[in-house]
């Protein structure tokens, strides 16, 4: 079948990085600069993606593969193939329509992207809070009170207090 197909269609012999040039008796011509073909048998080469503006080149275009972009520092990729760059926030913040805002009390974000998530509720697992949560870090749950052997010193953390100068939103 492959042989018959190539007899019928000379273009099927053109490898990736070339195109089947109708203007030159269907011979395989190399892709012109700034273009590529990632599969064989193509009648045209695709234009290379250009990483410009807030995008920067992660991988250069070659005759057989497209360029790949990522984002300039302070931004991160969104979407398939990094179709958009979204601004980073600081840890302990989330991006809203009004820019980066601190996480509300009782929530945290340990990354520069994404939303603030509620602290883990240790009591749901029958555990106690070992380390209080912050805007940047989740609480750390410790053993349940029942797990502590008699006479073992149990640390009872103070009730979570609002951080100075931080009001819920």
């Amino acid at each position: 079948f492959e042989r018959t197909r190539s007899l019928q269609d000379p273009c099927s012999n053109c490898p990736a990085g070339t195109f089947c040039d109708n203007n030159r008796n269907q011979i395989c011509s190399p892709c012109p600069p700034n273009s590529f073909s990632s599969a064989g048998g193509q009648r045209t080469c695709d234009i290379c993606r250009q990483c410009k503006g807030v995008f920067r080149t992660r991988k250069e275009c070659s005759s057989t593969s497209n360029a790949e972009c990522d984002c300039t520092p302070g931004f991160h990729c969104l979407g398939a193939g990094c179709s958009m760059c979204e601004q980073d926030c600081k840890q302990g913040q989330e991006l809203t329509k009004k820019g980066c805002k601190d996480c509300c009390f009782g929530t945290f974000n340990d990354q520069k992207r994404g939303i603030c998530r509620p602290w883990t509720n240790c009591s749901l697992d029958g555990k106690s809070v070992l380390v209080n949560g912050t805007k940047e870090r989740d609480v750390v749950c410790g053993p349940s009170p029942a797990d502590l052997s008699p006479g073992a010193s149990s640390v009872t953390p103070p009730a979570p207090a609002r951080e100075p100068g931080h009001s819920p939103q």
Partner: nanobody, 122 residues
Framework: QVQLQESGGGLVQAGGSLRLSCAAS????????IGWFRQAPGKEREWVSC????????YYADSVKGRFTVSRDNAKNTVYLQMNRLKPEDTAVYYC???????????????WGQGTQVTVSS
């Protein structure tokens, strides 16, 4: 033809001021957020400031907060970046950009200017 054009760059002594303009042609700049970026030689492009289209809310990088002010005059189809108390580390090519969505998201279809050189000497 849709175009953004920066102007107002130049050579200034440390502590001095400059006002950059970003003028739009071929589209209504008032419908877009406008971001300012800069790129120093051998360094990555860096976000500086942005002004929203809806309510003219302004946002600034920590490095320029309190020294730079962004404003817009939609009647003149222009956005301004007032730069005061300039430092040698502010030396860069300054670009304006009109993102399709808002101040915080940029795509490959956004409009960008060609840049204007700002040099701050000590």
């Amino acid at each position: 033809q849709v175009q953004l054009q920066e102007s107002g760059g130049g050579l200034v002594q440390a502590g001095g001021s400059l006002r950059l303009s970003c003028a739009a042609s071929g589209f209504s700049l008032g419908l877009y957020a406008i971001g300012w970026f800069r790129q120093a030689p051998g360094k990555e492009r860096e976000w500086v400031s942005c002004i929203m289209s809806s309510d003219s809310s302004a946002y600034y990088a920590d490095s320029v907060k309190g020294r730079f002010t962004v404003s817009r005059d939609n009647a003149k189809n222009t956005v301004y970046l007032q730069m005061n108390r300039l430092k040698p580390e502010d030396t860069a090519v300054y670009y304006c950009a009109a993102p399709q969505s808002d101040c915080f998201h940029y795509s490959e279809n956004d409009y960008w200017g060609q840049g204007t050189q700002v040099t701050v000497s000590s």
